[in-house]
Interface confidence: low
């Protein structure tokens, strides 16, 4: 099957990196500079993707693979194979159409994108407030008043833990 | 073959400003960054930062954003670095060398010797 | 900046052994990392890309692996012409930077 295919199309034959050249006998020519194509058998390259302004090239583009982009230090990816870049915001805080916003009162965040979430509602479980919550930080329920009668043991908060990923640079 | 073609030395006085070369050859210089590298004696790597020659776009490390200029000439598929204000400190080997994320071919290097 | 750190500052072994280079990074950096080996009086010379990928022309016993901050460089039976300084160096954010270096020694 394979070699009736290349009989009949001649352009089977030709590798990733590059296409079939019409105006050339369907010869295979390479993929010209800055773009590429990552299967056989293609009739033209594909463009590279260029990784610039606030996106920065991950993985450089080759004559088989496109280019891959991430975010400039202070920015973050959005969408399939980082088609955006959102700015980043402190932990404690929201981006809105207007910039960086500190979270309301009664919500947290403790990442640098995404949005502000309420705190536990620690009292729907049946549970008191151990430790307060925080603009960066959600609040730490602990037992019920019932289950701190004398005798029962103390509880020690946990103390906070690093987020990974947010370490300073 | 991919060569990166930098001057032996350069001997200069301090104050004054130095331009040192990366002749490109064997691959199509306006596809590849061109960074720069500096290399105190019996020390380490420092990046000083690189130049896309396609747009001329550059990207510096800060310590060097007053010392180091990064210029290409696409005719010539020439680098240049000038380096401005010199002292002692700037006594160094310097390298060029090709590529994006991982620096894959390298030239040889120019020792700077700054010296009244 | 990202701190690189290398360690040990000197590895001596002898020939035949398998060395291990460490570099860990000061932040998360997935698998951003090159390795170099420096001759004496050379240019460094690219021996891994992206933590673990092989580059064409150099020798199979060098290897790399690791990612998010942890990376190691691998060489299996080490020869006499191996006596290098290595450096890795990450690429995950301007600027560049290297780690301080290993020396490798022959015993």
């Known amino acids: 099957f394979e070699r009736t295919r290349s009989l009949q199309d001649p352009c089977s034959n030709c590798p990733a990196g590059t296409f079939c050249d019409n105006n050339r006998n369907q010869i295979c020519s390479p993929c010209p500079p800055n773009s590429f194509s990552s299967a056989g058998g293609q009739r033209t390259c594909d463009i590279c993707r260029q990784c610039k302004g606030v996106f920065r090239t991950r993985k450089e583009c080759s004559s088989t693979s496109n280019a891959e982009c991430d975010c400039t230090p202070g920015f973050h990816c959005l969408g399939a194979g980082c088609s955006m870049c959102e700015q980043d915001c402190k932990q404690g805080q929201e981006l809105t159409k207007k910039g960086c916003k500190d979270c309301c009162f009664g919500t947290f965040n403790d990442q640098k994108r995404g949005i502000c979430r309420p705190w536990t509602n620690c009292s729907l479980d049946g549970k008191s407030v151990l430790v307060n919550g925080t603009k960066e930080r959600d609040v730490v329920c602990g037992p019920s008043p019932a289950d701190l009668s004398p005798g029962a043991s103390s509880v020690t908060p946990p103390a906070p833990a690093r987020e990974p990923g947010h370490s300073p640079q | 073959q991919v060569q990166l073609q930098q001057p032996g030395a350069e001997l200069v006085k301090p104050g004054a400003s130095v331009k040192l070369s990366c002749k490109a050859s064997?691959?199509?210089?306006?596809?590849?960054?061109i960074n720069w590298v500096k290399q105190r004696p019996g020390q380490g790597l420092e990046w000083i930062g690189n130049?896309?020659?396609?747009?001329?776009?550059?990207n510096y490390n800060e310590r060097f954003k007053t010392k180091a200029t990064l210029t290409v000439d696409i005719s010539s598929s020439t680098a240049y670095m000038r380096l401005s204000s010199l002292t002692s400190e700037d006594s160094a080997v310097y390298y060029c060398?090709?590529?994006?994320?991982?620096?894959?071919?390298w030239g040889q290097g120019t020792t700077l010797t700054v010296s009244s | 900046d990202i701190l690189l750190t290398q360690s040990p500052a000197i590895l001596s072994v002898s020939p035949g052994e398998r060395v291990s280079f460490s570099c860990r990074a000061s932040?998360?950096?997935?698998?951003?990392i090159q390795w170099y080996q420096q001759r004496t009086n050379g240019s460094p010379r690219l021996l891994i890309k992206y933590a673990s990928e092989s580059l064409s022309g150099i020798p199979s016993r060098f290897s790399g692996s690791g990612s998010g901050t942890d990376f190691t460089l691998s060489i299996n039976n080490v020869e006499s012409e191996d006596i290098a300084d290595y450096y890795c160096q990450q690429s995950h954010s301007w600027p560049f930077t290297f780690g301080s270096g290993t020396k490798l020694e022959i015993k």
């Open positions: 932040q998360i950096i997935g698998t951003t």
């Open positions: 060398a090709r590529g994006q994320l991982g620096l894959d071919y």
């Open positions: 064997g691959y199509t210089f306006t596809n590849f960054w």
């Open positions: 130049i896309y020659p396609g747009n001329t776009g550059t």
